[in-house]
């Protein structure tokens, strides 16, 4: 059984067709196609809901950039 020791990688089979406001997003993670049927981005919202999104869509890329900048900026 391959990767039996590791936790299974969650996968996405469909993508949301609605743009999510960045104010609702807390974090994201990328899913690669070698482990799953589709390359995907999984956004976690501020209420801890996880949503699959298409990494090819511009709003998804913009949201990831926004979250990256948020993480890099120290909160004072």
């Amino acid at each position: 059984q391959p990767d039996a020791i590791n936790a299974p990688v969650t996968c996405c089979y469909n993508f949301t067709n609605r743009k999510i406001s960045v104010q609702r997003l807390a974090s994201y993670r990328r899913i690669t196609s070698s482990k799953c049927p589709k390359e995907a981005v999984i956004f976690k919202t501020i209420v801890a809901k996880e949503i699959c999104a298409d990494p090819k869509q511009k709003w998804v890329q913009d949201s990831m950039d926004h979250l990256d900048k948020q993480t890099q900026t120290p909160k004072t």
Partner: nanobody, 125 residues
Framework: EVQLVESGGGLVQAGGSLRLSCAAS????????MGWFRQAPEKEREFVAA????????YYADSVKGRFTISRDNARNTVYLQMNSLKPEDTAVYYC??????????????????WGQGTQVTVSS
């Protein structure tokens, strides 16, 4: 607990065909995706194909599109991988795996957590 048993592997010449079977037991599979993965010596395990049990939607890795076909038989709780135009680079251990789907269409799944023991496919040139 989901149990998966693969069969149908073997030795075949390049250009030939094989059909792998994966018999599933121990659960209700309507909320599952069933997938095939492969692992060649010294390489990472890679996704090959998947089918959503409920609706029958299929997904393929680019490397097998047009050559491999995944299907399922609900009555037999079995998933098949028909492999045509086999190439030496398809040589690997092929694993069947089950993935519990999320509660909604856009929610991530639990991940491929249940695995079969694997079946060896060797394609000679």
């Amino acid at each position: 607990e989901v149990q998966l048993v693969e069969s149908g592997g073997g030795l075949v010449q390049a250009g030939g065909s094989l059909r792998l079977s994966c018999a599933a037991s121990g659960g209700t599979f309507s909320n599952y995706a069933m997938g095939w993965f492969r692992q060649a010596p010294e390489k990472e395990r890679e996704f090959v194909a998947a089918v959503i049990w409920r609706g029958g939607s299929t997904y393929y890795a680019d490397s097998v599109k047009g050559r491999f076909t995944i299907s399922r038989d609900n009555a037999r709780n079995t998933v098949y991988l028909q492999m045509n135009s086999l190439k030496p680079e398809d040589t690997a251990v092929y694993y069947c795996a089950a993935d519990l789907l999320g509660n909604s269409d856009y929610e991530p799944s639990s991940g491929f957590g249940s695995w079969g023991q694997g079946t060896q496919v060797t394609v000679s040139s």
